[in-house]
């Protein structure tokens, strides 16, 4: 195809007449505005055929694009065109019109897009503004097709002098309908309701504008509808919720909720389920195993911890001996229960360095309305072993004894034992064990007490040795659950001078 | 919060007429035009007109002139759009979506069937 004058831009004096002429190897025809005005088209003998297009007392409504083509490009190769930009310089006309369709522009992504606001004259400076502000807006200029760049969804104007008059286009509405892969979360104010309560699920999703909720719930299957309520969250852009509620909830609205949420720009879809279960009745349950009896250290710390479910929220207590207990100003008792899930508590008792006083029986005790339920325990204050005395004796039986007491919680078990070799042992040969069993004539007495107030027992024990001829250390060790405690005395022959 | 609810989903049949709603709420309804846009299956987003909800001015694309009417009831601060003649080409989900200058408003779509 040949262009005559070749362009690709002209600027024509407004009220001038001007021709244009395109030939080719095949029928050429001239358009303007997707339509094809007035023009004579010719064969010359050669074969090759032309169109000629006059423009007569040109104005600024000219002004745009003209393109010549093969009137029917279906036998040819190329689907060629040339295009031709014509500018007619006209103070009268401002802007050239737009179709409707140019001032409403519509996205689902981010992209280029362009503003296709022109002037008839190439020399004019045009800015773009958004259409409530003043300030011109960085975006590249073509006289020929307008602004063009990645636009925020806002309504803009553009703006040019001609003369020393200001000229505003019409506004250009920029639509950008947010869409993403949908991700869709589903909560319940609560997963557990008694009967007569409210059920209420919300269904969120973020980063779409436009998406369908449907639920699936168990009145929906019997035909009972409910209408949910949709909703834009303020302060967050993009966030849409979806409300079923439920009121005066049946034992029968026990079941699966589902949210399907789809998004028909990108054809995309998303589901989260989730589990509602109605009671008649509240309920409070006891989970795992407390023992019936618990211990504490003497003087350490010791939390007892109770785990249970229940709804609705219980009132818990705690009693010790029958008397409620609560937390302490001195700190010396510390009372708490939490919700670790939507029906799950755990309670604890903390006692901060247990005293003896502190043995005795603790009872918790939860309780709503519709529902309580207890648990008790006995609390032993185990103290550690303390060998109190260690004594040698000569009665006059000519036997010599030796009495070990010591005191303890749980009860002391006690070991004698003795190092004849007194320069080997207990370094380098093991201690012999002593008592009534052992190869030694020795007997041995053990009395247990116990002592209500202190709450511990006393070991009073006696070891007889029948003759002693050679020095002895005897050893008494006292030992319990939590701890041993050992003396020793130098036991010597009645006919050595000194002991 | 600016939301535009639209009327529930149809089926037609070709040759007859179909009247989507999309009711307002959060703004002032008469302060903005209302745009319809519709996207058929597989296919990008296509204006179909605009209305002023303050004198009622609409703007139409080529395309619908002879088809389509845009009105509005600022009682209800509802917009209609009504669609004549269907054909199976008609089939799409049409949206309503107001521009606040800032950012625009979308309804959340009525898909519209035509189907013999």
């Known amino acids: 195809l040949v262009v005559t004058p070749p362009g690709p831009e002209l600027v024509l004096n407004v009220s001038s007449t001007f021709v244009l002429t395109c030939s080719g190897s095949a029928p050429v025809v001239w358009e303007r505005m997707s339509q094809e005005p007035p023009q004579e088209m010719a064969k010359a003998q050669d074969g090759t055929f032309s169109s000629v297009l006059t423009l007569t007392n040109l104005t600024g409504l000219d002004t745009g694009e003209y393109f010549c083509t093969h009137n029917d490009s279906r036998g040819l190769e190329t689907d060629e065109r040339k295009r031709l930009y014509i500018f007619v310089p006209d103070p009268t006309v401002g802007f050239l019109p737009n179709d409707a369709e140019e001032l409403f522009i519509f996205l689902t992504e981010i992209t280029e897009i362009t503003i296709p606001c022109r002037v008839t004259d190439p020399q004019l400076v045009v800015t773009l503004h958004e259409k409530k502000g003043d300030v011109a807006l960085p975006v590249p200029y073509d006289h020929q097709r307008g602004f063009s760049g990645i636009f925020e969804d806002r309504s803009y104007i553009c703006k040019t002098t001609i003369g020393d008059r200001e000229v505003d286009s019409d506004a250009y509405y920029v639509y950008r309908l947010q869409v993403s892969s949908i991700n869709v979360s589903v909560n319940a104010v609560q997963t557990v309701v008694r009967q007569g309560e409210n059920i209420t699920l919300m269904c969120i999703v973020i980063g779409n504008e436009v998406v369908n909720f449907e639920w699936t719930y168990p009145r929906k299957e019997s035909g009972r509808l409910v209408e949910p309520v949709t909703d834009f969250l303020l302060d967050m852009p993009y966030h849409i919720r979806s409300i079923l509620h439920i009121p005066s909830a049946e034992l029968e609205d026990s079941g699966t909720y589902t949210c399907n949420v789809t998004e028909s720009v990108n054809d995309h879809q998303d589901e989260k389920a989730i589990n509602i279960t109605v009671v008649e009745s509240g309920y409070v349950r006891l989970l795992g195993e407390v023992g019936t009896l618990q211990f504490a250290e003497l003087h350490r710390s010791r939390t007892l911890q109770v785990v249970f479910e229940a709804y609705p929220p219980p009132t818990v207590l705690w009693f010790k001996d029958n008397r409620t207990l609560g937390d302490s100003s001195a700190g010396e008792i510390a009372l708490s229960t939490r919700n670790v899930s939507e029906t799950r508590y755990v309670s604890e008792l903390t006692l901060v360095r247990v005293k003896v006083a502190e043995a005795g029986h603790y009872t918790m005790r939860a309780f709503h309305e519709d529902a309580e339920v207890q648990l008790s325990f006995q609390l032993q204050i185990n103290v550690p072993v303390r060998v109190l005395e260690l004594s040698e004796s000569h009665p006059d039986s000519g036997e010599q004894t030796v009495r070990c007491r010591g005191r303890g919680m749980p009860q002391p078990n006690i070991i004698w034992s003795a190092c004849r070799d007194l320069k080997r042992c207990p370094r380098e040969l093991p201690p012999t064990l002593l008592g009534n069993s052992s190869e030694e004539e020795s007997q041995l007495e053990t009395n247990v007490t116990y002592w209500e107030e202190e709450q511990e027992f006393e070991v009073v024990s006696t070891l007889r040795l029948q003759h002693v001829d050679r020095p002895l250390s005897v050893r008494c060790t006292l030992r319990n659950a939590v701890g041993q405690d050992t003396q020793e005395v130098i036991v010597v022959p009645h006919s050595l001078p000194f002991k | 919060q600016v939301q535009l609810v639209q009327s529930g989903a149809e089926v037609k049949k070709p040759g007859a007429s179909v009247k989507v709603s999309c009711k307002a709420s959060?703004?002032?309804?008469?302060?903005?035009?209302m745009s319809w846009v519709r996207q058929a299956p597989g296919q990008g987003l296509e204006w179909m007109g605009w209305?002023?909800?303050?004198?009622?001015?609409?703007k139409y694309a080529q395309k619908f002139q002879d088809r389509v009417t845009l009105t509005t009831d600022t009682s209800t601060s509802t917009a209609y759009l009504e669609l004549r003649s269907l054909r199976s080409d008609d089939t799409a989900v049409y949206y309503c979506?107001?521009?606040?200058?800032?950012?625009?408003?979308w309804g959340q779509g009525t898909l519209v069937t035509v189907s013999s």
């Open positions: 959060g703004y002032t309804f008469i302060s903005h035009g």
């Open positions: 979506a107001t521009h606040g200058g800032d950012r625009s408003y």
């Open positions: 209305i002023s909800a303050d004198n009622g001015n609409t």
